[in-house]
Protein backbone atom coordinates (compact mmCIF):
# COMPACT_ATOMS: atom_id res chain seq x y z
CA UNK A 1 0.00 0.00 0.00
CA UNK A 2 1.33 3.37 -0.72
CA UNK A 3 1.67 5.48 2.60
CA UNK A 4 -0.87 8.37 2.29
CA UNK A 5 -2.33 9.77 -1.09
CA UNK A 6 0.20 12.82 -0.85
CA UNK A 7 3.80 12.69 -2.22
CA UNK A 8 6.71 13.54 -0.15
CA UNK A 9 7.95 15.71 -2.28
CA UNK A 10 8.15 16.52 -6.13
CA UNK A 11 10.33 17.33 -8.44
CA UNK A 12 10.85 18.43 -11.75
CA UNK A 13 13.65 17.10 -13.99
CA UNK A 14 14.38 16.07 -17.42
CA UNK A 15 15.02 12.26 -18.43
CA UNK A 16 18.09 10.76 -20.40
CA UNK A 17 19.40 7.17 -20.95
CA UNK A 18 22.37 5.77 -19.71
CA UNK A 19 23.69 6.54 -22.99
CA UNK A 20 22.79 10.10 -23.01
CA UNK A 21 19.95 9.78 -25.30
CA UNK A 22 16.92 12.60 -24.51
CA UNK A 23 13.29 10.88 -23.65
CA UNK A 24 10.76 13.33 -25.57
CA UNK A 25 6.94 13.51 -25.61
CA UNK A 26 5.39 14.70 -28.34
CA UNK A 27 1.87 15.32 -29.05
CA UNK A 28 0.68 13.23 -32.32
CA UNK A 29 -3.09 12.85 -33.24
CA UNK A 30 -4.51 13.84 -30.29
CA UNK A 31 -2.42 11.23 -28.06
CA UNK A 32 1.34 11.65 -26.90
CA UNK A 33 3.95 9.77 -28.24
CA UNK A 34 7.11 8.73 -26.16
CA UNK A 35 10.71 9.17 -28.42
CA UNK A 36 14.14 7.99 -26.95
CA UNK A 37 16.43 10.39 -29.30
CA UNK A 38 19.85 12.20 -29.81
CA UNK A 39 18.63 15.92 -29.32
CA UNK A 40 20.48 18.51 -31.06
CA UNK A 41 22.44 21.00 -28.78
CA UNK A 42 19.97 24.42 -28.96
CA UNK A 43 16.87 21.69 -28.28
CA UNK A 44 15.24 22.57 -25.14
CA UNK A 45 14.81 19.08 -22.85
CA UNK A 46 11.75 17.94 -21.88
CA UNK A 47 10.77 18.35 -18.33
CA UNK A 48 8.92 15.60 -16.55
CA UNK A 49 7.13 15.97 -13.02
CA UNK A 50 8.25 12.95 -10.80
CA UNK A 51 6.22 12.99 -7.72
CA UNK A 52 7.82 10.63 -4.88
CA UNK A 53 5.80 8.32 -2.75
CA UNK A 54 6.23 6.19 0.57
CA UNK A 55 5.41 2.27 0.28
CA UNK A 56 5.73 -0.50 2.50
CA UNK A 57 5.97 -3.85 1.43
CA UNK A 58 4.54 -6.29 4.10
CA UNK A 59 7.11 -8.07 6.03
CA UNK A 60 5.59 -11.76 4.38
CA UNK A 61 6.85 -10.19 1.01
CA UNK A 62 10.44 -8.64 2.82
CA UNK A 63 11.36 -11.93 3.86
CA UNK A 64 12.55 -10.25 7.45
CA UNK A 65 10.13 -9.29 9.55
CA UNK A 66 10.40 -6.12 8.74
CA UNK A 67 7.52 -3.81 7.06
CA UNK A 68 10.44 -2.19 4.22
CA UNK A 69 9.64 1.34 3.28
CA UNK A 70 10.05 1.79 -0.64
CA UNK A 71 9.82 5.07 -2.54
CA UNK A 72 7.17 4.87 -5.42
CA UNK A 73 6.96 7.88 -8.41
CA UNK A 74 4.72 9.04 -10.73
CA UNK A 75 5.75 10.58 -14.12
CA UNK A 76 3.96 12.94 -15.73
CA UNK A 77 5.59 15.20 -18.50
CA UNK A 78 2.23 17.44 -18.68
CA UNK A 79 -0.51 18.27 -16.88
CA UNK A 80 -2.97 15.40 -16.29
CA UNK A 81 -1.02 12.81 -18.41
CA UNK A 82 0.77 10.25 -16.55
CA UNK A 83 3.32 7.45 -17.88
CA UNK A 84 2.01 4.05 -17.48
CA UNK A 85 2.76 0.70 -17.79
CA UNK A 86 0.99 -1.67 -20.46
CA UNK A 87 1.93 -5.15 -19.17
CA UNK A 88 -0.14 -7.02 -21.85
CA UNK A 89 1.82 -5.04 -24.13
CA UNK A 90 5.09 -4.51 -22.77
CA UNK A 91 4.76 -1.14 -23.40
CA UNK A 92 5.27 2.32 -21.65
CA UNK A 93 2.48 4.78 -22.47
CA UNK A 94 1.19 8.59 -21.72
CA UNK A 95 -2.69 8.50 -20.72
CA UNK A 96 -4.88 11.12 -19.04
CA UNK A 97 -6.07 10.31 -15.44
CA UNK A 98 -7.56 11.52 -12.46
CA UNK A 99 -6.39 11.22 -9.11
CA UNK A 100 -6.25 8.44 -7.33
CA UNK A 101 -4.08 7.07 -10.03
CA UNK A 102 -4.34 3.59 -11.42
CA UNK A 103 -1.66 1.12 -9.82
CA UNK A 104 -0.46 1.17 -13.36
CA UNK A 105 1.12 4.65 -13.01
CA UNK A 106 3.36 3.83 -9.78
CA UNK A 107 6.91 2.64 -10.25
CA UNK A 108 9.58 1.96 -7.35
CA UNK A 109 12.55 3.74 -7.69
CA UNK A 110 15.76 1.85 -7.65
CA UNK A 111 19.00 3.68 -7.51
CA UNK A 112 22.48 1.96 -9.46
CA UNK A 113 25.62 2.71 -9.88
CA UNK A 114 26.20 6.14 -9.02
CA UNK A 115 23.68 8.64 -10.21
CA UNK A 116 21.57 6.36 -12.34
CA UNK A 117 18.06 5.39 -11.60
CA UNK A 118 15.60 2.49 -12.91
CA UNK A 119 11.93 1.69 -12.46
CA UNK A 120 10.49 -1.33 -11.67
CA UNK A 121 6.35 -1.62 -12.58
CA UNK A 122 4.68 -1.67 -9.22
CA UNK A 123 1.94 -4.24 -11.18
CA UNK A 124 4.77 -5.96 -12.23
CA UNK A 125 8.04 -6.94 -10.08
CA UNK A 126 10.74 -7.58 -12.08
CA UNK A 127 9.31 -5.39 -14.91
CA UNK A 128 10.88 -2.31 -15.68
CA UNK A 129 10.79 0.63 -18.27
CA UNK A 130 13.32 0.52 -20.48
CA UNK A 131 15.01 1.43 -24.01
CA UNK A 132 14.00 -0.50 -27.07
CA UNK A 133 14.26 0.15 -30.81
CA UNK A 134 14.35 3.97 -29.98
CA UNK A 135 11.18 3.55 -27.61
CA UNK A 136 10.72 3.02 -23.88
CA UNK A 137 9.44 -0.43 -23.24
CA UNK A 138 8.61 -2.60 -20.01
CA UNK A 139 11.66 -5.08 -19.87
CA UNK A 140 11.40 -8.33 -17.61
CA UNK A 141 14.62 -8.55 -15.43
CA UNK A 142 15.71 -11.58 -14.00
CA UNK A 143 16.96 -10.71 -10.26
CA UNK A 144 19.55 -13.70 -10.39
CA UNK A 145 20.99 -11.48 -13.19
CA UNK A 146 23.21 -7.83 -12.74
CA UNK A 147 20.35 -5.80 -12.32
CA UNK A 148 22.91 -3.05 -13.74
CA UNK A 149 21.78 -3.59 -17.44
CA UNK A 150 22.24 -0.61 -19.14
CA UNK A 151 19.13 -0.42 -21.25
CA UNK A 152 17.04 -0.21 -18.00
CA UNK A 153 19.38 2.65 -16.32
CA UNK A 154 18.52 6.28 -17.06
CA UNK A 155 19.39 9.80 -15.83
CA UNK A 156 17.54 12.24 -13.80
CA UNK A 157 18.63 15.70 -14.22
CA UNK A 158 16.97 18.11 -11.88
CA UNK A 159 15.48 21.21 -12.96
CA UNK A 160 15.25 23.66 -9.88
CA UNK A 161 12.36 25.76 -9.88
CA UNK A 162 9.24 25.87 -8.68
CA UNK A 163 7.30 22.44 -8.40
CA UNK A 164 4.34 23.95 -9.87
CA UNK A 165 3.14 21.47 -12.77
CA UNK A 166 4.30 22.23 -16.24
CA UNK A 167 2.99 23.51 -19.50
CA UNK B 1 13.62 -4.32 16.02
CA UNK B 2 16.17 -3.57 13.85
CA UNK B 3 19.74 -3.98 14.97
CA UNK B 4 23.26 -3.17 13.59
CA UNK B 5 26.44 -4.82 15.50
CA UNK B 6 29.96 -3.68 14.70
CA UNK B 7 32.94 -5.39 16.00
CA UNK B 8 36.19 -6.22 15.09
CA UNK B 9 37.57 -2.42 15.95
CA UNK B 10 41.26 -2.26 17.87
CA UNK B 11 44.68 -0.74 17.90
CA UNK B 12 46.68 -1.56 15.07
CA UNK B 13 50.01 0.25 13.76
CA UNK B 14 50.50 2.41 11.01
CA UNK B 15 50.51 -0.21 7.66
CA UNK B 16 48.64 -2.94 9.35
CA UNK B 17 45.19 -4.15 8.46
CA UNK B 18 41.77 -4.98 10.61
CA UNK B 19 38.47 -6.85 9.39
CA UNK B 20 35.00 -4.68 10.67
CA UNK B 21 32.35 -7.21 10.81
CA UNK B 22 28.32 -5.39 11.34
CA UNK B 23 26.20 -8.35 11.95
CA UNK B 24 22.18 -7.54 11.49
CA UNK B 25 19.14 -8.83 12.71
CA UNK B 26 15.27 -7.63 12.17
CA UNK B 27 16.40 -7.08 8.34
CA UNK B 28 17.95 -9.07 5.62
CA UNK B 29 20.69 -6.91 4.10
CA UNK B 30 20.50 -8.06 1.21
CA UNK B 31 17.71 -5.70 0.53
CA UNK B 32 19.13 -2.84 1.37
CA UNK B 33 21.72 -0.32 0.48
CA UNK B 34 24.40 -0.62 3.03
CA UNK B 35 27.27 2.30 3.58
CA UNK B 36 30.18 2.94 6.10
CA UNK B 37 30.57 6.04 8.31
CA UNK B 38 33.23 6.76 10.29
CA UNK B 39 34.01 9.78 12.65
CA UNK B 40 37.08 11.05 13.72
CA UNK B 41 37.13 11.69 17.58
CA UNK B 42 35.68 15.16 18.30
CA UNK B 43 35.01 15.20 14.36
CA UNK B 44 32.29 15.25 12.10
CA UNK B 45 30.77 12.12 9.88
CA UNK B 46 32.31 11.04 6.98
CA UNK B 47 31.02 8.67 4.49
CA UNK B 48 33.72 5.69 3.77
CA UNK B 49 31.65 3.01 1.39
CA UNK B 50 28.57 1.81 0.32
CA UNK B 51 26.49 -1.34 -1.39
CA UNK B 52 23.38 -0.53 -3.24
CA UNK B 53 20.55 -2.55 -2.33
CA UNK B 54 19.63 -2.73 -6.14
CA UNK B 55 22.85 -3.72 -7.26
CA UNK B 56 26.03 -1.89 -7.79
CA UNK B 57 29.08 -1.24 -5.44
CA UNK B 58 30.90 -0.99 -4.09
CA UNK B 59 31.74 2.15 -4.01
CA UNK B 60 34.55 3.92 -2.01
CA UNK B 61 35.32 7.56 -1.12
CA UNK B 62 38.72 8.80 -2.26
CA UNK B 63 40.30 8.28 0.93
CA UNK B 64 39.96 4.80 1.10
CA UNK B 65 39.95 3.78 -2.11
CA UNK B 66 42.55 1.06 -3.02
CA UNK B 67 43.07 0.14 0.58
CA UNK B 68 39.57 -0.67 1.67
CA UNK B 69 37.30 -3.71 0.83
CA UNK B 70 33.27 -3.70 1.48
CA UNK B 71 31.50 -6.98 1.34
CA UNK B 72 28.44 -8.38 2.80
CA UNK B 73 27.79 -12.10 3.22
CA UNK B 74 24.06 -12.49 2.64
CA UNK B 75 23.94 -15.99 4.01
CA UNK B 76 25.62 -14.42 7.31
CA UNK B 77 23.33 -11.03 6.93
CA UNK B 78 26.44 -9.77 7.75
CA UNK B 79 28.56 -6.55 5.94
CA UNK B 80 32.33 -6.37 6.30
CA UNK B 81 34.90 -3.53 5.99
CA UNK B 82 38.28 -4.64 5.24
CA UNK B 83 41.03 -2.25 5.89
CA UNK B 84 44.37 -2.42 4.50
CA UNK B 85 47.81 0.04 4.53
CA UNK B 86 46.16 2.07 7.75
CA UNK B 87 46.90 5.36 8.60
CA UNK B 88 46.73 7.97 11.44
CA UNK B 89 44.27 9.61 9.88
CA UNK B 90 41.85 6.25 9.60
CA UNK B 91 41.76 6.91 13.16
CA UNK B 92 37.77 6.76 14.49
CA UNK B 93 34.95 5.25 15.22
CA UNK B 94 33.22 3.14 12.20
CA UNK B 95 29.75 3.05 11.83
CA UNK B 96 27.75 0.90 9.34
CA UNK B 97 24.15 2.22 8.36
CA UNK B 98 20.98 1.39 6.53
CA UNK B 99 19.39 3.03 3.61
CA UNK B 100 15.69 4.24 4.70
CA UNK B 101 14.44 2.87 1.36
CA UNK B 102 14.91 -0.61 0.16
CA UNK B 103 16.10 -0.23 -3.31
CA UNK B 104 16.80 3.98 -3.12
CA UNK B 105 19.53 6.26 -1.10
CA UNK B 106 17.04 9.47 -1.11
CA UNK B 107 16.32 8.74 2.76
CA UNK B 108 19.05 8.86 4.17
CA UNK B 109 20.31 6.21 6.72
CA UNK B 110 17.68 5.38 9.09
CA UNK B 111 19.50 2.64 11.18
CA UNK B 112 23.07 2.98 12.23
CA UNK B 113 25.07 0.53 14.72
CA UNK B 114 26.33 1.67 17.83
CA UNK B 115 29.99 1.97 16.29
CA UNK B 116 33.33 0.24 16.58
CA UNK B 117 36.97 2.08 17.28
CA UNK B 118 39.64 1.76 15.13
CA UNK B 119 42.59 3.53 16.66
CA UNK B 120 45.99 3.69 14.15
CA UNK B 121 49.20 4.55 16.15
CA UNK B 122 53.00 3.31 16.64
CA UNK C 1 31.31 15.86 -4.90
CA UNK C 2 28.40 18.19 -3.27
CA UNK C 3 29.55 19.95 -0.44
CA UNK C 4 27.16 20.89 2.55
CA UNK C 5 27.70 24.00 4.90
CA UNK C 6 26.26 24.08 8.05
CA UNK C 7 25.19 26.79 10.42
CA UNK C 8 25.87 28.17 13.05
CA UNK C 9 28.34 25.42 14.06
CA UNK C 10 27.39 25.86 17.49
CA UNK C 11 24.42 27.34 19.54
CA UNK C 12 23.95 28.33 23.01
CA UNK C 13 20.32 28.05 24.09
CA UNK C 14 17.68 27.39 26.80
CA UNK C 15 15.17 24.76 27.71
CA UNK C 16 12.08 26.16 25.78
CA UNK C 17 13.74 28.32 23.25
CA UNK C 18 13.06 28.11 19.31
CA UNK C 19 16.03 26.71 17.66
CA UNK C 20 16.99 26.97 14.24
CA UNK C 21 19.96 25.18 12.14
CA UNK C 22 20.49 25.69 8.28
CA UNK C 23 22.37 23.73 5.80
CA UNK C 24 23.39 24.66 2.40
CA UNK C 25 24.72 22.76 -0.47
CA UNK C 26 27.07 23.52 -3.23
CA UNK C 27 24.81 22.67 -5.57
CA UNK C 28 20.62 21.85 -5.81
CA UNK C 29 19.44 18.47 -4.04
CA UNK C 30 15.62 18.86 -5.03
CA UNK C 31 14.89 17.82 -1.73
CA UNK C 32 16.72 14.82 -0.86
CA UNK C 33 18.26 16.39 2.30
CA UNK C 34 18.39 13.81 6.05
CA UNK C 35 18.46 15.13 9.48
CA UNK C 36 21.24 13.81 12.33
CA UNK C 37 20.92 13.96 15.97
CA UNK C 38 23.98 12.64 17.76
CA UNK C 39 24.50 12.85 21.22
CA UNK C 40 27.69 12.14 22.93
CA UNK C 41 29.46 8.67 22.57
CA UNK C 42 26.33 7.38 20.66
CA UNK C 43 25.09 6.57 16.80
CA UNK C 44 23.52 9.31 15.04
CA UNK C 45 19.99 8.86 14.60
CA UNK C 46 17.39 10.38 11.85
CA UNK C 47 15.38 12.82 12.41
CA UNK C 48 14.40 14.44 9.05
CA UNK C 49 13.95 12.70 6.05
CA UNK C 50 13.47 14.08 2.04
CA UNK C 51 13.82 17.42 3.70
CA UNK C 52 10.47 18.08 5.53
CA UNK C 53 9.11 14.49 6.34
CA UNK C 54 9.70 13.55 10.13
CA UNK C 55 11.00 9.81 10.83
CA UNK C 56 8.80 7.27 12.90
CA UNK C 57 8.86 8.15 16.64
CA UNK C 58 10.46 11.29 16.67
CA UNK C 59 8.86 14.81 18.05
CA UNK C 60 6.72 16.71 16.71
CA UNK C 61 8.71 19.66 18.05
CA UNK C 62 11.32 19.01 15.25
CA UNK C 63 10.46 20.32 11.98
CA UNK C 64 12.33 20.49 8.41
CA UNK C 65 12.38 22.84 5.52
CA UNK C 66 13.64 23.81 2.46
CA UNK C 67 14.49 22.34 -1.28
CA UNK C 68 17.06 22.95 -3.68
CA UNK C 69 20.15 24.13 -1.82
CA UNK C 70 19.00 25.86 1.36
CA UNK C 71 17.19 23.86 4.29
CA UNK C 72 16.34 24.54 7.61
CA UNK C 73 16.09 22.48 10.50
CA UNK C 74 13.67 23.81 13.40
CA UNK C 75 13.20 23.05 17.13
CA UNK C 76 10.04 24.88 18.65
CA UNK C 77 10.76 23.92 22.00
CA UNK C 78 14.20 22.97 23.37
CA UNK C 79 13.62 20.47 25.56
CA UNK C 80 16.78 19.39 28.20
CA UNK C 81 17.20 15.64 25.40
CA UNK C 82 17.76 18.00 22.46
CA UNK C 83 20.86 19.11 23.60
CA UNK C 84 23.18 17.49 21.17
CA UNK C 85 25.37 17.53 17.76
CA UNK C 86 22.80 17.86 14.69
CA UNK C 87 23.83 17.01 11.13
CA UNK C 88 22.10 17.43 7.71
CA UNK C 89 23.42 14.71 4.78
CA UNK C 90 22.43 15.42 1.17
CA UNK C 91 20.95 12.36 -0.67
CA UNK C 92 20.32 13.28 -3.88
CA UNK C 93 23.68 12.26 -5.54
CA UNK C 94 26.29 9.74 -4.82
CA UNK C 95 28.36 10.09 -2.19
CA UNK C 96 26.80 10.75 0.00
CA UNK C 97 27.79 14.16 1.78
CA UNK C 98 27.47 15.60 5.46
CA UNK C 99 27.59 19.20 6.93
CA UNK C 100 29.76 19.98 9.58
CA UNK C 101 27.79 19.69 12.69
CA UNK C 102 25.96 22.20 14.81
CA UNK C 103 26.79 22.06 18.40
CA UNK C 104 23.57 22.76 20.62
CA UNK C 105 25.07 23.46 23.91
CA UNK C 106 22.83 24.46 27.13
CA UNK C 107 23.32 28.43 27.67
Known amino acids: SITGISPITESLASLSTYNDQSITFALEDESYEIYVEDLKKDKKKDKVLLSYYESQHPSSESGDGVDGKMLMVTLSPTKDFWLQANNKEHSVELHKCEKPLPDQAFFVLHNRSFNCVSFECKTDPGVFIGVKDNHLALIKVDYSENLGSENILFKLSEILEHHHHHH | EVQLVESGGGLVQPGGSLRLSCAASGITLSSYGMSWVRQAPGKGLEWVAS????????YYADSVKGRFTMSRDNSKNTLYLQMNSLRAEDTAVYYC???????????????WGRGTLVTVSS | DIQMTQSPSSVSASVGDRVTITCRAS??????LAWYQQKPGKAPTLLIY???SLQTGVPSRFSGSGSGTDFTLTISSLQPEHFATYYC?????????FGGGTKVEIK
Open chain 3, 27 to 32: QGITSW
Open chain 2, 97 to 111: AKDRYSGSYYGGFDY
Open chain 3, 50 to 52: AAS
Open chain 3, 89 to 97: QQANSFPPT
Open chain 2, 51 to 58: IFGSGGGP
